[in-house]
Amino acid sequence: RGVFRRDAHKSEVAHRFKDLGEENFKALVLIAFAQYLQQCPFEDHVKLVNEVTEFAKTCVADESAENCDKSLHTLFGDKLCTVATLRETYGEMADCCAKQEPERNECFLQHKDDNPNLPRLVRPEVDVMCTAFHDNEETFLKKYLYEIARRHPYFYAPELLFFAKRYKAAFTECCQAADKAACLLPKLDELRDEGKASSAKQRLKCASLQKFGERAFKAWAVARLSQRFPKAEFAEVSKLVTDLTKVHTECCHGDLLECADDRADLAKYICENQDSISSKLKECCEKPLLEKSHCIAEVENDEMPADLPSLAADFVESKDVCKNYAEAKDVFLGMFLYEYARRHPDYSVVLLLRLAKTYETTLEKCCAAADPHECYAKVFDEFKPLVEEPQNLIKQNCELFEQLGEYKFQNALLVRYTKKVPQVSTPTLVEVSRNLGKVGSKCCKHPEAKRMPCAEDYLSVVLNQLCVLHEKTPVSDRVTKCCTESLVNRRPCFSALEVDETYVPKEFNAETFTFHADICTLSEKERQIKKQTALVELVKHKPKATKEQLKAVMDDFAAFVEKCCKADDKETCFAEEGKKLVAASQAALGL
């Protein structure tokens, strides 16, 4: 059976149940429902999932049974629309239920909320978690899927199954350990951090597909897979790109059963043909399915083939460039991107896509000119500034990071981005700038050849977080412009923004800068966030404040918190010293 070329099935739900098995089927349906109805209680979702599963089993027994021929969207949509409190809980999303498929599913997709109003997940005591795990392992793991899926409505579903498997393994091992906390907490921290990163990466893939179309996603995939599999033929890369695009289109479209099934098929195909794809796949291909798919997705770049010919000969010097381009534009551009990317694992994917776009624009112009060859002869010279811009930016920022350390580097970015786009909400500016700042510890440790792909492609993921959060409640034309004009130029667009001179400073509000003794019991991370929130508010009040002024105020603030947290009567200290600090800060900033 060719990958994705399936026989027609009388019952799609039976087909997927059989392919995936009951456990994965139930988990994926739960994820799908939680990603659509993000506010519904856990118990309601479990009930819906059980009903769908029982129905699927009747279809497995008899594919001709009533309703078994219905599409998955119809079955799942009908089930979601039975929720009694739909109108009260979700407001206008309830209107989706008046629509027919496929419009109904599109409507549900449009109502996915990247920043749902849900309480922060608080981690219970280790003993409490271990008891819950032992009492009802199945419910405990379902709850994990539910809580992650509803907070991350675009989380890559088959990958969430992999996270859940690791979550289960952590509890299985650590709840028997002598020091449960020492065993479990680092594992949970790692899963949390990896999960957030995975969610953000997938969110960019979905944004790419949904906002910029399949061609944009395919171009990204050609570049990335060509870097990763430089020994593979162009046709092999093209086939993988086509299949990968189908998988991500399905997952981003809420077709999670099809997505998981097709991802498994793709992993199988890659492993069966690894000799033609990459020498680095051997270990991945020996693992069980979920680990295998994850491992393939993260596999290191294969070595570049020796003696690759110069690109200039066929893409610039040849007199046949326009003829070859005209024959099949996207294939020719795809080959250019493939050939360039496999030679440049040291470039970010977004840089490679900028180069390909420049090449395409040049051919469009030159192939209509009187002397095409003369016109496009210098096209590679146009690449130089495009390559140097991210190189210089990364060099400067890594130097700054090494000089300041992560926290102060984040603060520098907080100030920089608040001045660029002060209309953006303070929590979003704090979250995004903190994540932008993490590029330092993540990428600056790498040698030159790995810095750019690490840094710029990571920044694309973080800036997409800003774009999706801003899209929900747009407040800045500059953010909208950078987010919507070009996917690959988002980072250069934001980098190029200067201080927003049109911004009217925020009114001073002493309450914003009033702190209480509860800050003393916060974790170091939470305390940093409090201070960074104050810093953003300070810049919003005084956008023209100098670095020196802001540093002085922040240093005073840190000293104030440290002093009051050591005081016997903390609350009184915060009240009295806080007033003095606010007055001194106002004076220092001329507020």
Epitope: N273, S276, E339
Partner: nanobody, 125 residues
Framework: EVQLLESGGGLVQPGGSLRLSCAAS????????MGWFRQAPGKEREGVSS????????FYTNSVKGRFTISRDNSKNTLYLQMNSLQPEDTAVYYC??????????????????WGQGTLVTVSS
């Protein structure tokens, strides 16, 4: 439509060399991925080497790496296969094939659209 015509086959002693040629005519875009395949008696047709006429990238099956070299002359629309250190197991009919670069995969002959008649290479003492 595309026509492919191989030449250069023959009898050679083990350790010897041969150079195969393949002249292509017709729509050259349809031949922008070209390859050499071989079929020994009683065996399936297998990919030997392929080249993109745009970009110039080359690919070889493991058993011929370091011994065979594929090349092309775009101005003459001709594909070559330089075969050195020939062994008796290299004996086969060698076919020239062509197709679209977005489809052609060396391990899968069905992804090539156009084929020559073949030229016999015999390695024997």
């Amino acid at each position: 439509e595309v026509q492919l015509l191989e030449s250069g086959g023959g009898l050679v002693q083990p350790g010897g060399s041969l150079r195969l040629s393949c002249a292509a005519s017709g729509n050259t875009y349809l031949t922008s991925c070209m390859g050499w395949f071989r079929q020994a008696p009683g065996k399936e047709r297998e990919g030997v080497s392929s080249i993109y006429t745009v970009g110039g990238s080359t690919f070889y099956t493991n058993s011929v790496k370091g011994r065979f070299t594929i090349s092309r002359d775009n101005s003459k629309n001709t594909l070559y296969l330089q075969m050195n250190s020939l062994q008796p197991e290299d004996t086969a009919v060698y076919y020239c094939a062509a197709g679209s670069p977005a489809r052609c995969r060396l391990r899968d002959p069905t992804t090539f659209d156009y084929w020559g008649q073949g030229t016999l290479v015999t390695v024997s003492s």
